[in-house]
Structures are given as C-alpha cells and as structure tokens.
C-alpha cells in the first residue's frame, strides 16, 4: 500500500512502473555535473564526487560521462531520463546495476558513457572489457 | 496502525559497539514502498540522520560517521537493527528509528519513542 | 553537507497570534524540504514535505512556502498545543539534514 498522504498528493507521474511492472522510486545519484579528473588507463574508477542527489523523477537513472581531448580529461555526473537522449546519444544500459563504460563517436575527444539504475552506481565507473555485456554470461552475473 | 519501537541497551561503554533493533508492527518491513532508518539526537541539540533503506535497495548511510555504522534487516522478524562500533561520548542520543514513504525518499512519517543511549564507563 | 540555517532561534509570541519561522539552505535544495513539530520528551511529528504539502492529520494552519534556498513555516493563528520546537529538513542531497530549530515559546 501507498502511504496516504503520499496517495493523495503525489501526482500520478510520480507512480513510475518498469517493464516488470515493479514501481521505481526516486534514485540517489552521484551529481557533480563536469568536474577534472585523474581518471585515465584504469579497468575503474571511483567519481571523487561527493554529492549525493536525490533525482527529480523516479524515471531518472544515474549517469557518468568520461571525455579526453589533447587538454584535459573530465568527468560529469548526473540523474537522467533514459527516454531522452543524453549528448546525443540513447542511454542503451539504463536498467543495469552498474555503470559500464561504452566508447562514444565524438570528434576531437574520446567519450565514454554509461548509465545504471541503482543508488549512487555512477559513484563507480568501469571501464574494464571482462564487464562487456555482449558476453550471455556475465548478463547473469551483472543482473543478479 | 502501522508503528515501529526502538529497543536496547541503555548504557554503553567507550569504545565499544552500540546495538538497538526496531520492531515494526501493523505492516510488513518487506513493502518497498516504505523507507527504513535511524536518527538521533544529543540531548538538548538537533536531529542528525543516521541511515535509511528500503527492502530491496541499497542502505545508505551518513558519511559523518566513517562507517562506523551497520543497518541490516530481520524479515522474519519483522525488524531491522543499528549496530554503531567506536562509540564515544558524542554518540550519546537519543535514538529513533523511523519510517517514511520511499516515493519521497528522506521524509520521515513515523517515529519510534526514541530510547536514550548514554555511552560512559 | 548542505547546512539548514533557521531563524529566529526563539520565537516569543501569544495565543492566537500569527508565527513565521524561516530555514535557509546553503545551496538549492529544490523543493525538498520538511518541517517537523518536536514537544519536549516526544519525537518529531512530520508536518509539511517538500516545502508546501502538509502531512496527513496536519491542521489547515500550518502551512510552508519557498523554493530553492529560503523557506517559510507559518502558523497562522497560534494553538496551545503549538508552543514546541520545530526543525526544517533537507532531502535534495544526501545525507538529509536538519536545520538547528526554532522554539516557539508562549510570551
């Protein structure tokens, strides 16, 4: 059951099912927008972020997003509707617990990105091939 | 009438680890729309936010207490406990446990009757 | 962290009279925030979320307001069983956290 107060004043968008039909409750996120990182040539890396937000819809996952050009390399996190494109690109890996980096085209720069659906998963971006989801194996193992 | 009720120890002494269990009654722990936790308060200051839950999701606690924290649950039971190791003096409070709905996480509708914990030798 | 300060840090007022109590944020908490009632020996009882939704069994009276990093509670015409402190809370980054509260005491 749905606490009272809570059913007669949250608005109806706020009841959020996936395709399980499971309700999905707000998320709590790494969201530091883009700020400098050190991260480089690492199977993983931890986001040094350390703010922790509650995101506005229960639709929203986490999102982490690793750039490197001849200048500097950045990291940005956020909460994100994963019906909407985020920097052009469709967040493909939103329903995954962890946040599994993917190489991105982008001129001048090499852009990774990932997106995951549980609490603070963009505090640990990955970056290692053994997590590569094309294999049927480890989509059990991730998805347990 | 769903309600929850802190229950401990109300002496501890320095150094070692405070444990307290919440008994919940008039609903299941397990119902994921309800957010679980524990919050305290020094005697005569403010409320200061321990950690919280829901069934199926991840504990988070409040990076002030350097992991010195330890939520876990007890379906069978119907309850969840707070074990809080290294105690000083400062971890003397007032502790509530606490319930709220998980579809606006952070807000607590129901209270325990807090239970006092005081930490001395 | 971000840091709830409210203010007055005493509110001396009569009976029917009308009580504004202020919480400023450190930085935008969005609409996410709470104001709780504590009486002494009690435990807080949840009274307004996310600045402005009153809580189940909340009289008319109470009421909040603001967005972003101020915040106002007003009781509109002060109870008997008003006189206690009140706490704002913040849920937009976590931990939450709790402003230092305001006593509203009979003058």
């Known amino acids: 059951t749905i606490p009272p107060h809570v059913q007669k004043s949250v608005n109806n968008d706020m009841i959020v099912t996936d395709n399980n039909g499971a309700v999905k409750f707000p998320q709590l996120c790494k969201f530091c927008d883009v700020r400098f990182s050190t991260c480089d040539n690492q199977k993983s890396c931890m986001s040094n972020c350390s703010i922790t937000s509650i995101c506005e819809k229960p639709q929203e996952v986490c999102v982490a997003v690793w750039r490197k050009n001849d200048e500097n390399i950045t990291l940005e996190t956020v909460c994100h509707d994963p019906k909407l494109p985020y920097h052009d690109f469709i967040l493909e890996d939103a329903a995954s617990p962890k946040c599994i980096m993917k190489e991105k085209k982008k001129p001048g720069e090499t852009f990774f990105m990932c997106s995951c659906s549980s609490d603070e998963c963009n505090d640990n971006i990955i970056f290692s091939e053994e997590y590569n989801t094309s294999n049927p194996d480890l989509l059990l193992v991730i998805f347990q | 009438q769903l309600q929850v009720q802190e229950s401990g120890p109300g002496l501890v002494k320095p150094s070692e680890t405070l444990s307290l269990t919440c008994t919940v009654s008039?609903?299941?722990?397990?119902?994921?729309?309800?957010?679980w936790g524990w919050i305290r308060q020094p005697p005569g200051k403010g409320l200061e936010w321990i950690g919280s839950?829901?069934?199926?999701?991840?504990?988070y606690y409040n990076p002030s207490l350097k992991s010195r924290a330890t939520i876990s649950i007890d379906t069978s039971k119907n309850q969840f406990s707070l074990k809080l190791s290294s105690v000083t003096a400062a971890d003397t409070a007032v502790y509530y446990c606490a319930r709220g709905p998980t579809l606006i996480r952070g807000v607590i509708d129901s209270w325990g009757q807090g239970t006092l914990v005081t930490v001395s030798s | 962290e971000i840091v709830l300060t409210q203010s007055p840090a005493t509110l001396s007022l009569s009976p029917g009279e009308r009580a504004t109590l202020s919480c400023r944020a450190s930085q935008s908490v969005r609409s996410y925030l709470a104001w709780y009632q504590q009486k002494p020996g009690q435990a807080p009882r949840l009274l307004i979320y996310d600045a402005s939704n009153r809580a189940t069994g909340i009289p008319a009276r109470f009421s909040g307001s603001g967005s972003g990093t101020d915040f106002t509670l007003t009781i509109s015409s002060l109870e008997p069983e008003d006189f206690a402190v009140y706490y704002c809370?913040?849920?937009?980054?976590?931990?939450?956290?709790f402003g230092q509260g305001t006593k509203v005491e009979i003058k």
């Open positions: 809370q913040q849920r937009s980054n976590w931990p939450p956290t």
């Open positions: 008039g609903g299941s722990i397990s119902n994921a729309y309800f957010s």
């Open positions: 839950f829901y069934y199926g999701g991840k504990t």
